[in-house]
């Protein structure tokens, strides 16, 4: 025998108190699949969270973070404070990146500058707290005859044969 509750669509629950008829989810609750025996409480976006998508009878609310914060975790389960570029968030708040490290975003940790010499390259542009170093060509790339790009042949006028 088919379960009568399987006929209850999303947005309803199978109401045992009313002979298993499909009853609408109460306000501030939802059911995203059919055949449910209860609805689920809507997520409430409070405090540092703000509502990105309202709850409906068939889908939960979605939250994001107020300005100055960014989402972390599945479904924006946490909000973490933004820092400025050139900083990272520590237990004591936003701190400048130590010398030799950088962060070009408002989140995440300071990362070490690229070590150009590991690739046999020189530093073309120095790093800052906000930007990584820019590595220049290796000394070998600068030596005469080392260029891998052949210059284009000079253009000839039509009708002239090469001398």
């Amino acid at each position: 025998l088919q379960d009568p509750c399987s006929n209850c669509p999303a947005g309803t629950f199978c109401d045992n108190n009313r002979n298993q008829i499909c009853s609408p989810c109460p306000p501030n609750s939802f059911s995203s699949a059919g055949g449910q025996r209860t609805c689920d409480i809507c997520r409430q976006c409070k405090g540092v969270f703000r509502t990105r998508k309202e709850c409906s009878s068939t889908s939960n609310a979605e939250c994001d973070c107020t300005p100055g914060f960014h989402c972390l975790g599945a479904g924006c389960s946490m909000c973490e404070q933004d820092c400025k570029q050139g900083q990272e968030l520590t237990k004591k708040g936003c701190k400048d990146c130590c010398f030799g490290t950088f962060n070009d975003q408002k989140r995440g940790i300071c990362r070490p500058w690229t070590n150009c010499s590991l690739d046999g390259k020189s530093v073309l542009v120095n790093g800052t707290k906000e930007r990584d170093v820019v590595c220049g060509p290796s000394p070998a790339d600068l030596s005469p005859g080392a260029s891998s790009v052949t210059p284009p042949a000079p253009a000839r006028e039509p009708g002239h044969s090469p001398q």
């Epitope: 629950f13 108190n17 109460p26 501030n28 609750s29 025996r37 689920d40």
Partner: nanobody
Framework: EVQLLESGGGLVQPGGSLRLSCAAS????????VGWVRQAPGKGLEWVSA????????YYAESVKGRFTISRDNAKNTLYLQMSSLRAEDTAVYYC???????????????RGQGTQVTVSS
């Protein structure tokens, strides 16, 4: 035992008003989330209005916003629905409902009462 007794329904002309009452026993309306659902002829149940978050907020269906007002009298343990500017499509049996929050996180509701018939017709 939870009991809900609705009253105040009747026949009213379009544009008219009614006030429904729901006398509750077995629980305290001021301490629970309560509201009104209705069932129009040949249709399923529909949420009309509710007092939520122990009175912190109210809910109204789009179709009744600005026309219906939900309230409660804690001393009388009674829930009310003031209905104005009534339309033919408001014709239904109106039930008082108590929203039930289950330990596992689920939500349902109890109606228990027999409901009160509201008919809007000229």
């Amino acid at each position: 035992e939870v009991q809900l007794l609705e009253s105040g329904g009747g026949l009213v002309q379009p544009g008219g008003s009614l006030r429904l009452s729901c006398a509750a026993s077995g629980f305290t309306v001021s301490a629970e989330d309560v509201g009104w659902v209705r069932q129009a002829p040949g249709k399923g149940l529909e949420w009309v209005s509710a007092i939520l978050d122990k009175g912190g907020s109210t809910y109204y269906a789009e179709s009744v916003k600005g026309r219906f007002t939900i309230s409660r009298d804690n001393a009388k343990n009674t829930l009310y629905l003031q209905m104005s500017s009534l339309r033919a499509e408001d014709t239904a049996v109106y039930y008082c409902a108590r929203i039930v929050y289950h330990a596992g996180g689920g939500v349902t509701f109890d109606t228990r009462g027999q409901g009160t018939q509201v008919t809007v017709s000229s």
